[in-house]
């Protein structure tokens, strides 16, 4: 006869490990007892259990409550046992010693591998600002046994670097993602992907990128100067900019206070029916936590009568 076992038994932390030991004997052969021991404990073998054909399973005090026989139906030639709720410390070498009649004794050895799935964590780097050089966007750490694989999934252009720390029974892997911040990256997902044999599927943690910036400011509304004449209603100036975080707007007049009746509504400056009082230099001040920008325009309110007189003069002058 011969013993059938596995070279390696792999389980995930917390699962039950079946340690196989089956005697494939000739007809009439019997298994008297099967002794299971851990054999890499350093100070000699450590008994797990003794499986006796007459007296059943006797679990060693060191493994009390943790070793069972597989559920029925049971073959009398099967010396396999279940190690319940495998922990990392169970990883190691085990052997079964089988005493048979009349063929004598047999032994087999196997390695129990306990996979410890990682619990990844993602830590964003310092605040990203446009104009910075290569900057840490995020780091992702995962510890497990064996060492997990940590990669990044993103459309953003960047560079990655990884380092690994080995502990007694596990390894921690940290991967960093560096990039040169630009406003186009805003709102883009940066996903840490952790792979491990103890996971049914990859674990993914997504971080949304936020890059602080403030665009140049410009003012719209003066494209057609002829519309800015006395009496015109609904005239307005709009300050154009964009930023992250979203900017706030402030309007001032360079050559004095804002005329009465002029309404400030965020990025928009609304005028009452125009008078010559509204002529002047207006400044839009845009700011966020990152920066501030100014844009100024000159409003020149035209008097239609003066304009027509001038035109006549111009005509007569010609």
């Amino acid at each position: 006869g011969e013993l059938e076992t596995s070279d390696v038994v792999t389980v995930v932390l917390g699962q039950d490990a079946k340690l196989p030991c089956f005697y494939r004997g000739d007809s009439g052969e019997q298994v008297g007892q099967v002794a299971w021991a851990r054999v890499d404990a350093g100070e000699g073998a450590q008994e797990l259990a003794l499986l006796h054909s007459k007296y059943g399973l006797h679990v060693s005090p060191a493994y009390e409550g943790r070793v069972e026989q597989p559920p029925p139906p049971r073959n009398p030639l099967d010396g396999s046992v279940l190690l319940r709720n495998a922990v990392q410390a169970d990883e190691g070498e085990y052997e079964c010693r089988v005493s048979t009649f009349p063929a004598g004794s047999f032994q087999a050895r196997l390695r129990l591998r306990v996979l410890v799935p990682p619990l990844p964590s993602l830590n964003p780097g310092p605040a990203l600002e446009e104009g910075q050089g290569l900057t840490l966007a995020a780091s992702c750490t995962a510890e497990g046994s064996p060492a997990p694989s940590v990669t990044w999934d993103t459309e953003v252009k960047g560079t990655t670097s990884s380092r690994s720390f080995k502990h007694s029974r596990s390894a921690a892997v940290t991967s960093e993602f560096h990039l040169v911040p630009s406003r186009s990256m805003n709102g883009q997902p940066l996903t840490c992907v952790v792979s491990h044999p103890g996971l049914l599927q990859d674990q993914r943690i997504t971080h949304i990128l936020h890059v602080s910036f403030l665009a140049e400011a410009s003012v719209r509304g003066l494209e057609d100067q002829n519309l800015w004449h006395i009496g015109r209603e609904g005239a307005m100036l709009k300050c154009l900019s964009e930023g992250q975080p979203p900017p706030s707007y402030n309007w001032t007049r360079l050559d004095g206070p804002l005329p009465s009746g002029v309404r400030v509504d965020g990025d928009t400056l609304g005028f009452p029916p125009l008078t010559t009082e509204h002529s002047g230099i207006y400044v839009c001040h845009v700011s966020n936590e990152f920066s501030s920008r100014d844009s100024q325009v000159t409003v020149d309110v035209l008097d239609p009568q003066e304009d027509s007189g001038k035109q006549v003069d111009l005509v007569s002058a010609s």
């Epitope: 002794a35 000699g44 797990l48 004794s105 032994q107």
Partner: antibody
Framework: EVQLQQSGPDLVKPGASVKISCKAS????????MHWVKQSHGKSLEWIGR????????SYNQKFKDKAILTVDKSSTTAYMELRSLTSEDSAVYYC?????????????WGQGTLVTVSA | DIVLTQSPASLAVSLGQRATISCRAS??????????MHWYQQKPGQPPKLLIK???NLESGVPARFSGSGSGTDFTLNIHPVEEEDTATYYC?????????FGGGTKLEMK
Amino acid sequence: EVQLQQSGPDLVKPGASVKISCKASGYSFTGHYMHWVKQSHGKSLEWIGRVNPNNGGSSYNQKFKDKAILTVDKSSTTAYMELRSLTSEDSAVYYCARDPLGGSYGFAYWGQGTLVTVSA
Amino acid sequence: DIVLTQSPASLAVSLGQRATISCRASQSVTTSSYSYMHWYQQKPGQPPKLLIKYASNLESGVPARFSGSGSGTDFTLNIHPVEEEDTATYYCQHSWEIPYTFGGGTKLEMK
């Protein structure tokens, strides 16, 4: 310090029973099997059996299956061996013994021995 | 049951010389990991004392003049150099299977 303190010598009549005790101290009582070994005068050693202090489960040498009963009292960290239907063949020194590490093999710690004399 | 046969039954050795005791098992007690054979010393009126475990591993506190070797079915206990206090009976014991058994013993005396 691991100590196994056995009860004193016993003189018993043939056909009677005797119960030997082995008080354990200095270690986790439930973490190790307690073994019992017989040594007849001028003879070698014979392994009688072992008991698991966690649950009282015992394994015997078939030769002693009907002779010895192994029990434990967890509260007093004491192991007992009762010998029944005694004959002169049972006159011997009986030892309790413990393994070096939880579940490992060999007997690193021994009681001082209890002499049982069976005589009419 | 596994039978352990020790030889010689008794042995007289001069101080400082080597004492060699053999133990033969009726079947192999060795795996790829360990040999499940142990050696004990017993002095009159005392319990046995573990000297060597797993064929060759010296038990803590045991003098280095004691050594064990062997595998499979043949095992040896060596004492060198022998000292006066080594006068005792020596036993081998296997823990391959239940029942554990002991050899018949070897009585060591000084010449």
